[in-house]
């Protein structure tokens, strides 16, 4: 074409893949009549007619652009829809009258790549390798043109460094014309890189300017020899019997060596290997005081067969022994004194408490409980609690039952029971004393006796209500070696005129929980003799 060398640089039009490129023919009126224009695409210096304008009417030429071209702006602009990477070329418009002139447009096409996908080398990297090893691969798909990749370690860009860092990038063209970039980072790593964060960054251009996308951060398995092994115990702090304790070996190498945990036999002072679980953890559950002792860990590198030994660690499982109370089963006379002594062993300082079992009341802080001028009501349970104040939850207890000699003591002396004739009545009678009483009834029926506690008994009688029984009532007699006592149950017929019985009368169970009589407590009191009294 004559005079082509003097032609100005083509006008640059930039669009993203998939959008519409507006190709404006820049011929002035003096250069040609825009109502008579031919449009060409230029590929590898070969022109192809793609569109013609005649009397302001456009007509696509058969071919790759046939469906995507249209006229806009009263014929001055050619619109190219659904732009693809293959459309990146020169387009020119040529006016035919008064003389042939042309105007060149360079179409530039862009497509942002997808988020970069980073894959770490799953096999890991030994620190003593002779040359850079593959650390990670970064893939940026479907970008145009080819994006630039930058690798980062701990937020700093990596540069090529002979025998240290090598970045190997390649790209493939998809059928769409878009590029997929693959970049492999190879490096020689050191032990400190075990926690290093690597990522890749894709830099690319769009019509709007320069952009970048970052991958996620990854760490690389770094293999380095073990220099030290040590033991770790969980939970940290004071251990107590009953805890779940885990003893594990740790090493500063990767992969860790093969571990074995040993405990020193206190008798032979020899280290004896303990059985660990599949994870190499020695689980003590529940921990016992016998687990206390000196533990150590051996790490064996199966590649080099080098063995390393940890510093020994003393494990102390704190304990409280079984609590012993003396006397173990005290029997005392009413009015006498009793000293209860509590003993236990522990790995720590112990605190003792005495509680009344029935009420939970704290009676004494200390190992010795002194009970003076014992009353019958003092009989029952006393609990010694031996605890280690510095270790919450570490305690043992022992219950002792104090028996006060006494004749039977009835829960009630007399009671009215509302009944219907011919009904089967369930009567009960409760007595306490020491020795524990037995109960008998003055009528025939099915009786069963239940020991409520070491000094108390409950007898239940099933009996048919008869006229004779209504007349005589029912007596229960409690007896032990110290005496006898009787309670009377008066049976009253329920009829229409009988008022609803108050809360103190029952039709069934005939027991009571009234408090016992208590006697004055003075230094030396002249008394009536203690008797088998009743309460009710």
């Amino acid at each position: 074409v004559p005079g082509e060398a003097e032609q100005p640089a083509p006008e640059l039009v930039e669009v993203e893949v998939g959008s519409t490129a507006l190709l404006k023919c820049g011929l002035s009126q003096s250069q040609g009549n825009l109502s008579h224009v031919d449009w060409f695409s230029v590929h590898k210096e070969k022109r192809t007619l793609i569109f013609r304008v005649r009397q302001g009417q456009g007509q696509s030429e058969p071919g790759e652009y046939e469906q995507r071209l249209s006229l806009q702006d009263r014929g001055a602009t050619l619109a190219l829809t659904q732009v693809t990477p293959q459309d990146e070329r020169i387009f020119l418009c040529q006016g035919k009258r008064p003389r042939s002139q042309e105007y060149r447009i360079q179409l530039r096409v862009y497509k942002a790549p997808e988020e970069p996908n980073i894959q770490v080398n799953p096999l890991g990297i030994p620190v003593n390798s002779k040359e850079p090893e593959e650390v990670a691969t970064c893939v940026g798909r479907n970008g145009y043109p080819i994006p630039q990749v930058i690798w980062y370690k701990n937020g700093r860009p990596l540069k090529e460094e002979k025998n240290r860092v090598h970045i190997q990038s390649s790209q493939t063209v998809e059928s769409s014309g878009l590029y997929t970039l693959q970049s492999i980072l190879k490096a020689q790593l050191v032990k400190e890189d075990k926690d290093a964060q690597f990522y890749c960054e894709l830099n690319y251009r769009l019509p709007s300017g320069n952009h970048m996308k970052e991958s996620r951060e990854v760490t690389v398995p770094v293999f380095y020899p073990t220099e030290k092994v040590w033991l770790e115990v969980e939970p940290v702090g004071m251990l107590k019997e009953g805890d779940r304790v885990e003893i594990r070996c740790l090493a500063d190498g990767n992969p860790p060596p093969h571990f074995s945990i040993s405990k020193q036999n206190p008798s032979t002072r020899e280290a004896e290997e303990e059985t660990t679980n599949d994870n190499g953890v020695l689980v003590l559950e529940p921990a016992r005081k016998e687990h206390s002792g000196r533990y150590e860990c051996q790490g064996l590198d199966l590649d080099t067969m080098i063995s390393l030994l940890s510093e020994p660690q003393e494990l102390l499982v704190n304990y409280v022994s079984d609590v012993r109370v003396s006397p173990a089963a005290p029997e005392r006379q009413e009015g006498s004194s009793l000293t209860l002594t509590c003993e236990a062993e522990s790995s720590q300082d112990l605190e003792f408490q005495w509680l009344r079992e029935e009420t939970g009341q704290v009676l004494e802080r200390g190992p010795v409980l002194q009970l003076h001028d014992l009353k019958r009501e003092a009989g029952g349970g006393y609990r010694c609690v031996a605890s280690v104040p510095s270790i919450p939850g570490l305690n043992r207890t022992q219950l002792v039952n104090v028996a006060i000699f006494g004749p039977p003591w009835m829960a009630f002396k007399e009671r009215k029971v509302w009944v219907k004739e011919n009904m089967v009545l369930n009567l009960s009678c409760e007595a306490s004393g020491h020795p524990r009483p037995t109960i008998s009834w003055n009528v025939n029926g099915t009786a069963s006796e239940q020991d409520q506690d070491p000094q108390r008994v409950l007898s239940t009688l099933n009996v048919l209500v008869t006229p004779e029984l209504l007349e005589t009532g029912v007596e229960c007699t409690a007896s032990n070696d110290l005496g006898k006592n009787t309670s009377i149950l008066f049976l009253e017929l329920v009829n229409l005129t009988t008022l609803t019985p108050d809360s103190n009368t029952t039709t069934g169970l005939s027991t009571s929980t009234a408090s016992p009589h208590t006697r004055a407590n003075s230094t030396s009191t002249e008394r009536k003799l203690p008797e088998p009294e009743s309460r009710g």
């Epitope: 005392r332 006379q333 009015g335 000699f405 005496g483 008394r527 003799l529």
Partner: antibody, heavy 120, light 107 residues
Framework: EVQLLESGGGLVQPGGSLRLSCAAS????????MSWVRQAPGKGLEWVSA????????YYVDSVKGRFTISRDNSKNTLYLQMNSLRAEDTAVYYC?????????????WGQGTTVTVSS | SELTQDPAVSVALGQTVRITCQGD??????ASWYQQKPGQAPVLVIY???KRPSGIPDRFSGSTSGDTASLSITGALADDEADYYC???????????FGGGTKLTVL
């Protein structure tokens, strides 16, 4: 072996006083109630007084109330009977006895007795 | 209230003898029984429902029925000759009672 040894008896004029002692050994003295029982010449046994193991409670037969006082010293394992305003009818052998279960249930050990004579 | 005993009872050697003690308090309390030989302190032979202290032979036994307590000696020996006292509490709880004693003669 349980042993009870009375002392302090003797001859006293009516209206006079005596203090009997009973030294106990062979058992935990403070855990047992103790009693004094007397026996007039040619007569039967008569309970006189009782005291609980801690000494907190005391009991007397009507005929000696206000005149006799029972007490004990658990640190010395000793039982006492202070007898004031003595009468001729108080003349007897006085035994101390240990109660097996509590105040005056049954006396399982007795001393050999000490003789009190009230006479002018 | 009182505890009443027969003043004297005799038994042929080797035979069984029953010494009784009667009183209202025996409905609530068991009697204790003591053997006393001349010039000696009393010795407990039966207490509680029917308990024997160690050293007392099983020829001695006790029982109660209503207001009467009994001491039985089976196969009486010459050595059993002594005074026997019953002991209980007054049913009012005020007093300790001894029976008047029963002199046992073994023939």
């Amino acid at each position: 072996e349980v042993q009870l040894l009375e002392s302090g008896g003797g001859l006293v004029q009516p209206g006079g006083s005596l203090r009997l002692s009973c030294a106990a050994s062979g058992f935990t003295f403070s855990s047992y109630a103790m009693s004094w029982v007397r026996q007039a010449p040619g007569k039967g046994l008569e309970w006189v007084s009782a005291i609980s193991g801690s000494g907190g409670s005391t009991y007397y037969v009507d005929s000696v109330k206000g005149r006799f006082t029972i007490s004990r010293d658990n640190s010395k394992n000793t039982l006492y009977l202070q007898m004031n305003s003595l009468r001729a009818e108080d003349t007897a052998v006085y035994y101390c006895a240990r109660d097996i279960w509590g105040v005056t249930t049954a006396f399982d050990y007795w001393g050999q007795g000490t003789t009190v004579t009230v006479s002018s | 209230s009182e505890l009443t005993q027969d003043p004297a009872v005799s038994v042929a050697l080797g035979q069984t003898v029953r010494i009784t003690c009667q009183g209202d308090s025996l409905r609530s309390y068991y009697a204790s029984w003591y053997q006393q030989k001349p010039g000696q302190a009393p010795v407990l032979v039966i207490y509680g429902k029917n308990k024997r202290p160690s050293g007392i032979p099983d020829r001695f036994s006790g029982s109660t029925s209503g207001d009467t307590a009994s001491l039985s000696i089976t196969g009486a020996l010459a050595d059993d000759e002594a005074d026997y006292y019953c002991h209980s509490r007054d049913s009012s709880g005020d007093q300790i009672l001894f029976g008047g004693g029963t002199k046992l003669t073994v023939l």
